[in-house]
């Protein structure tokens, strides 16, 4: 499996779109900032075999896609940017799925690192709960946007390390 330069461009475009989606000054949202306890250790990538790392990355993209494709999300963000964001995420998920299929035959270890996948799921549950508690306010969405931008940049760095291993 080769996470190509095209995939790397997808990552950069995804981050760029996330940056463009900002609709409110973060300086007016300091009261709403929140620590979502991003599971950083799952993205360090050293302890993982490739198939496991890819499955964690895929889960991250899938959960991000789910979060931003809700009705509440559609109301919060610019429709055109959101559509572009979906396309980029969808493309990245396809690339990762292709990699997962290839890697299964190569490695004898279980495909899914259950604990890592669960950590990512719980992280997104914390984000969803926060949005509900804040009644999907503009500031809550801005805080979440900033958080997802950071987590996507961790994902991008892990993918870079995987590419270097190829």
């Amino acid at each position: 499996c080769n996470l190509s330069q095209t995939h790397s461009l997808n990552n950069r475009r995804t981050l760029m779109l996330m940056a463009q989606m900002r609709r409110i000054s973060p300086f007016s949202c300091l009261k709403d900032r929140h620590d979502f306890e991003f599971p950083q250790e799952e993205f360090d990538g050293n302890q993982f075999q490739k198939a496991q790392a890819i499955s964690v990355l895929h889960e991250m993209m899938q959960q991000t896609f789910n979060l931003f494709s809700t009705k509440n999300s559609s109301a919060a963000w610019d429709e055109t940017l959101l559509e572009k964001f979906y396309i980029e995420l969808f493309q990245q998920m396809n690339d990762l799925e292709a990699c997962v299929i290839q890697e299964v035959g190569v490695e004898e270890t279980p495909l899914m690192n259950e604990d890592s996948i669960l950590a990512v799921k719980k992280y997104f549950q914390r984000i969803t709960l926060y949005l509900m508690e804040k009644k999907y306010s503009p500031c809550a969405w801005e805080v979440v946007r900033a958080e997802i931008m950071r987590s996507l940049s961790f994902s991008t760095n892990l993918q870079k390390r995987l590419r270097r291993k190829d």
Partner: antibody
Framework: EVQLQQSGGDLVKPGGSLKLSCAAS????????MSWVRQTPDKRLDWVSI????????YYPDSVKGRFTISRDNAKNTLYLQMSSLKSEDTAMYYC????????????????WGQGTSVTVSS | DIVMTQAAFSNPVTLGTSASISCRSS???????????LYWYLQKPGQSPQLLIY???NLASGVPDRFSSSGSGIDFTLRISRVEAEDVGAYYC?????????FGSGTKLEIK
Amino acid sequence: EVQLQQSGGDLVKPGGSLKLSCAASGFTFSSYGMSWVRQTPDKRLDWVSIITSGGSYTYYPDSVKGRFTISRDNAKNTLYLQMSSLKSEDTAMYYCARHAEGGGNYDYAMDYWGQGTSVTVSS
Amino acid sequence: DIVMTQAAFSNPVTLGTSASISCRSSKSLLHSNGITYLYWYLQKPGQSPQLLIYQMSNLASGVPDRFSSSGSGIDFTLRISRVEAEDVGAYYCAQNLELPFTFGSGTKLEIK
């Protein structure tokens, strides 16, 4: 290696204007918020302005609001501080600083600083 | 604005012994999210400030573990367990809880 190279400091008369620059290298400049902080002759640190990574949002304390303008050119990896209607109390060493990536907890720690550029306002 | 208060000088310390530097804020820096938005910076003679501690107790990258920080939300202490000659300089506390961000006036570490 992260580097912030500053320039533009000078001696100016009260009421005058000056533009400071901060050229960034060694990191993806467009992904980070930036600030200007000044150090007065009595060695106090005084935060002057902040700008978001994309440059759309800024904030200033009352002491400089309406006189100072922070801006950035992400294509040139450069941060600017346009200062006008300068007063003697603006005399200081001016530092540009990068903000650590904070995510949803908005951590505005300043993890890298420029070498500073000296501004003296005197007649 | 939140006012950060520091003593101008620390008690003189001998190299190899421990030192403490205090800082007080005019308002609690503990956010409802559980994070205390208190920071420590060190400015060595002739240099730019550098980040030492973020969010009250976390060591910045590359900072030796001789440094530690604790506090209550209003009163904060920076500790250096074994002072070295290179630790000399001015230590500034700062808050990022509210805008405008504010700094303490700085405490100079004095060596006996």
